[in-house]
Interface confidence: low
């Protein structure tokens, strides 16, 4: 009931708490002398459901049968209306609509650790919408019974606060949960278990790893476990991997040897425990141990390439280049590279350790047979040396690959194709494709890139260190024993018309013709491989079309003669450059008047 109900009463039958779908009778009745002043037949009793009028009646009492009430609480209020006055609240009542508890399902109990306490969980089923009390009962051997109640409306977990011990691991325990409310009760099916069934060990702790003699092949993982643990499972992975390696071990007693770890790799290790082969559940995974495995001496061999440059009649410069070993081959931090240069006939050798970079340049006599060996060293040792005999890589003309072409293949890729050399193609042991940014003046500091290709291949896709709008000098070498032949071509992955034309820096007269000299276009303005230069000229102050001379581009060429100018006529000259994408704007203009005699 609500309010003081001084003027009358509201009664509800059969009960204030009803089952969903039931009908209730609500009666509102006035107490004596509480009706309207003067004439009681003018009493108008009105029944409200929340704030909505559902029934009314003139007189001292009102009866109303109500159906279809929803789950939850519904408020009914009775009011009195008299002529010429506001409605007066008489009394009210709340009706609670709910359901009987469903049978609790999936009752399961667990004890976390040998020293933990038994706690059970279950599924309540549908919401009763009423106050429902849950009672959890645990019975064991020797008529032991524990009982605990939960009065939380959403109760689905209870901890008994008791600890099962392993003294009689086969003893049976039975748990049951009962739900009760004013509309009924229901009990779960009993759940029967032993100590071994429900104890979930604590995750292992104090995990550490030891490498005997700092070797990855002698690695032992140690940990601590609760006393009754029989099984462990270990999982481990390189820190940068998503896939775990899994190992199951029995009676490990807190240690296990791992045989397949990779050197110089950070691993993550976790361990889980279980008390019995087929009973009970696995513990949570332990906290991760992260540890780096020791280095081992490098495996594999360096990929080494070289370049020769003539200095003078007696000396040549050798530039050696090599690629870093992969992480799996380096097996540690590479501390230095060891380069040994040896003159094969005289046996003279020099060795140098190189740190911090992957190239080395030296000057040697042009005479003699020279060989180099390069190896990589970490704290545990060195890789097998890569040995190369220094030869003239382009000396054997008959070994030169034919019809070399270079074509753009998508963003920042160039597809290089060739035909085998005329000389017996089966003599080719491998091809090497080499590329470097084209720099006028042949700057030897420009980084060199290369890849090796099997003798049956006639194409290679180069993508490493390829930039758009840069011209690359590409060479294809065919190697056979101590001989090599090569062919070269220029190529780019993307091109545009050059951003500027060549700058004419001098015009000189020689025997009735002129020699034009120009500065190369800066590399960053060439926008790809140059194909041609054009020299334009016309008479000064003339409106006629200029004449032009087109010169194929050659890296080293920076001058060209023109012999078709008339003497004592002033000409204006300028130059442009062309890539496959088009022609540049004009370079600077120069005037020139040929002084020679007329014919």
């Amino acid at each position: 009931k609500i309010d003081a109900c001084k003027r009358g009463d509201v009664t509800v039958k059969p009960s204030h708490v009803i089952l969903l779908g039931s009908t209730v009778n609500i009666t509102c009745s006035l107490k004596p002398r509480q009706g309207c002043f003067h004439y009681s037949r003018r009493n108008k009793l009105i029944l409200y459901k929340f704030d909505r009028r559902i029934n009314f009646h003139h007189g001292h009492s009102l009866n109303s049968q109500v159906t279809g009430l929803p789950l939850g609480t519904t408020l009914f209020v009775c009011k009195l209306a008299c002529i010429n006055s506001d409605e007066i609240q008489i009394c009210g009542a709340e009706i609670f609509v709910g359901v009987a508890p469903e049978q609790p399902q999936n009752l399961s109990c667990i004890q976390k650790g040998e020293q933990g306490t038994v706690a059970c969980t279950w599924e309540r089923g549908r919401d009763t919408h009423l106050y429902t009390e849950y009672t959890l009962q645990l019975s064991g051997p020797k008529n032991l019974t524990w009982q605990k109640q939960c009065k939380d409306i959403y109760c689905d977990y209870l901890d008994f606060g008791i600890n099962l011990t392993p003294e009689s691991p086969e003893s049976n325990f039975t748990a049951k949960v009962t739900a009760v409310n004013s509309l009924g009760s229901s009990s779960s099916l009993p759940s029967t278990f032993t100590f071994l069934d429900i104890v979930r060990p604590l995750p292992p702790w104090d995990i550490r790893i030891k490498f005997q003699k700092a070797s990855v092949s002698r690695c032992t993982l140690y940990w601590r476990d609760e006393g009754l643990v029989l099984l462990n499972r270990l999982r481990y992975r390189p820190s940068n991997s998503r896939l775990w390696n899994m190992v199951n071990v029995t009676k490990a007693k807190g240690r296990h040897d791992l045989l397949d770890l990779k050197p110089f790799t950070e691993y993550e290790f976790q361990i889980s425990s279980k008390l019995h082969l087929y009973k009970g559940s696995w513990s949570d995974w332990s906290e991760s141990l992260r540890a780096q495995t020791p280095e081992e001496e490098p495996t594999g061999m360096l990929d080494v390439w070289y370049m020769k440059r003539h200095i003078d009649y007696s000396r040549q410069q050798i530039s050696l280049f090599w690629k870093n070993l992969s992480v799996s081959e380096a097996r540690g931090k590479i501390l230095h590279y060891q380069v040994t240069l040896q003159e094969l006939t005289g046996g003279k050798a020099m060795t140098q350790n190189i740190t911090g970079h992957t190239s080395w340049t030296t000057v040697i006599p042009r005479t003699g047979n020279w060989a180099v060996a390069v190896s990589a060293a970490n704290s545990k040792g060195s890789s097998l040396p890569t040995r190369i005999n220094i030869m003239n890589l382009c000396e054997a003309g008959l070994l030169a690959p034919r019809q070399v072409s270079a074509n753009s293949e998508g963003m920042d890729n160039i597809l290089v194709t060739w035909q085998p050399p005329r000389k017996d193609p089966s003599a080719v042991q491998e091809y090497v494709v080499e590329w470097r940014e084209l720099h006028p003046g042949g700057d030897t500091q420009v980084p060199l890139n290369w890849l090796r290709s099997r003798p049956y291949n006639v194409s290679a896709l180069i993508s490493e260190n390829i930039k758009s709008y840069i011209c690359y000098e590409i060479r294809v070498y065919a190697l056979s024993g101590d001989q090599g032949g090569c062919s070269s071509i220029l190529g780019n992955s993307k091109h545009k018309a050059p951003l500027s034309g060549p700058h004419i820096n001098a015009i000189t007269e020689e025997k009735g013709s002129i020699l034009i000299s120009w500065n190369s276009i800066p590399v960053q303005e060439q926008m790809g491989c140059l194909l041609h230069y054009r020299i334009y000229w016309k008479e000064r102050d003339s409106n006629s079309q200029p004449q032009l001379c087109e010169i194929p581009y050659r890296v080293s060429q920076n001058s060209h003669p023109i012999n078709s100018l008339q003497p004592r006529v002033t000409y204006v000259l300028w130059m442009t450059a062309l890539t496959a994408a088009g022609e540049s704007s004009h370079g600077n203009e120069r005037e020139f008047c040929l002084q020679g005699k007329a014919n």
């Epitope: 992957t358 500091q445 980084p447």
Partner: nanobody, 115 residues
Framework: QVQLQESGGGSVQPGGSLRLTCAAS????????MHWFRQAPGKGLEWVSS????????YYTDSVKGRITISRDNAKNTLYLQLNDLKSEDTAVYYC????????RGQGTQVTVSS
């Protein structure tokens, strides 16, 4: 894009000292190994020194060991090269680079050692 600006060069007598600075921008300096190169008049580019991204590992060419110290300040995106006991053969343009080939380098700063 990558920008490297060297400074601190100058003329100095043999036995003198200089500190070269390289201000870096346009890339993640703190995760990049850094390098110093030099180019003497009429000679090719020569590697001088390198330092790991965290600064823990340093490397030097034999001719400068004991006289040159490379260091870095990742908070300031700055690389340093301290030159001590300078000799006439140290005369060169000094460049800092973010790659070990010297391809990505700055404009350079001139160091001249003469009496």
């Amino acid at each position: 894009q990558v920008q490297l600006q060297e400074s601190g060069g100058g003329s100095v007598q043999p036995g003198g000292s200089l500190r070269l600075t390289c201000a870096a921008s346009g890339f993640t300096f703190s995760t990049s190994g850094m390098h110093w190169f030099r180019q003497a008049p009429g000679k090719g580019l020569e590697w001088v020194s390198s330092i790991s991204s965290g600064g823990g590992d340093t490397y030097y060419t034999d001719s400068v060991k004991g006289r040159i110290t490379i260091s870095r300040d990742n908070a300031k995106n700055t690389l340093y090269l301290q030159l001590n006991d300078l000799k006439s053969e140290d005369t060169a343009v000094y460049y800092c680079s973010k790659d070990p080939s010297g391809a990505t380098r700055g404009q350079g700063t001139q160091v001249t050692v003469s009496s």
